[in-house]
Every structure is written in structure tokens, then in C-alpha cells.
């Protein structure tokens, strides 16, 4: 997509505070980079319902980030 240029974040809003756990297929964390200077938490929804941005400051996002980091390190 041409909209993803340098300095472009994936989320166009601050992110929702929570997503129903039962609706979550996958959670991806995008760390600050050349493309975007902030952390973004992208939730892929089940049943091809697309993706939602989760507010990285929310309790749910912090739990997800902790879980992913624990798994990766």
C-alpha cells in the first residue's frame, strides 16, 4: 500500500481500550521503527473480520506485550 511510507504508523487512531478475548485470532506488536515512532498493538480478529488497533497504554495491551516478550526472550 502506498500509504505506508516512512513515518507512517499502521493505526490511524489511538487504539481501542479492549477487544473481546474470544474474538482474537492473533496479536502483533509493532515496535518503534523508521516507519512509526511508537509501539502499536494490532489485533487480528477471528472469522476474517479484519484487524483492530489496541491502545498500547491499555491494561489488555500491556498484558499482551508482556506475554509476547516473555515468549520471545
Amino acid at each position: 500500500f502506498p500509504m505506508f511510507k516512512r513515518g507512517r504508523c499502521l493505526c490511524i487512531g489511538p487504539g481501542v481500550k479492549a477487544v473481546k478475548v474470544a474474538d482474537i485470532e492473533k496479536a502483533s506488536i509493532m515496535y518503534p521503527s523508521n516507519n512509526c515512532d511508537k509501539i502499536e498493538v494490532i489485533i487480528t480478529l477471528k472469522e476474517n473480520k479484519g484487524q483492530r488497533c489496541l491502545n498500547p497504554k491499555s491494561k489488555q495491551a500491556r498484558l499482551i506485550i508482556k506475554k509476547v516478550e516473555r515468549k520471545n526472550f
Epitope: M3, C9, I12, P14, V19, I42, G50, R52
Partner: nanobody, 127 residues
Amino acid sequence: EVQLVESGGGLVQPGGSLRLSCAASGFTLDDYAIGWFRQAPGKEREGVSSISSSDGRTYYADSVKGRFAISRDNAKNTVYLQMNSLKPEDTAVYYCAADQGVVAYDALRPYRWLEVWGQGTLVTVSS
């Protein structure tokens, strides 16, 4: 009560201009991405333009690029759609929507905007 109210629609001649407003009550618009969408009679709702919450990134449908401009005034809790060089095919009910969770590639996909929708304002372009 959380709501969006659109205004500024009406009858205009081809080539004319209109400015639509989308005013929020019950919440602050600067915490949300805002989108303008339209639905012509017998057609599906389609994306027109949207603007991000933080950095003011804007998105436009190809059919309105260079003619429409989206802007936001956070002090007035309002988003505007300036529509110039209007064509008969721009005739539709125009809706605004606010959402915190939209990803960039869904910026013009109405079915991905899940949070707050207005009731719409009718724009008719006819001579």
C-alpha cells in the same frame, strides 16, 4: 450521550461547492480517527475521506481526490469536508464516523468503522 451530527448538505448545481460539518457530543473527537462516507440510492456505502487522530494523515477515494478536502478543528470538536467541483455522481447521503481502532488500510472501508456513526446529511448535485 455519545453522538455525531452531520450538517451542511443541500441542493447544489454541478461545479458548485458545499462544506459538510461533523460535530461530536459526549466525547472528544481528537481521540478518534474520523471518516466521511456516502451512500447513493441503491448503492453500497463507500469511503470518501478520513483523517487520523494524531498526525492528521488524510485519505481520499480516487473519485474525490483534488476536489474534496477533510480537516479537523479539535477546539470546536468538529470535522469538516470541503467539497468543490461537485458532480451529479456525488449525490448521496453523507455520513461521518469516529473510531479509535481503525488500521490505515481500512481508512476508507465503512464496514471496518465500528464505533460511532452519524445519521447523515443529504447532498444533491443537480441543475
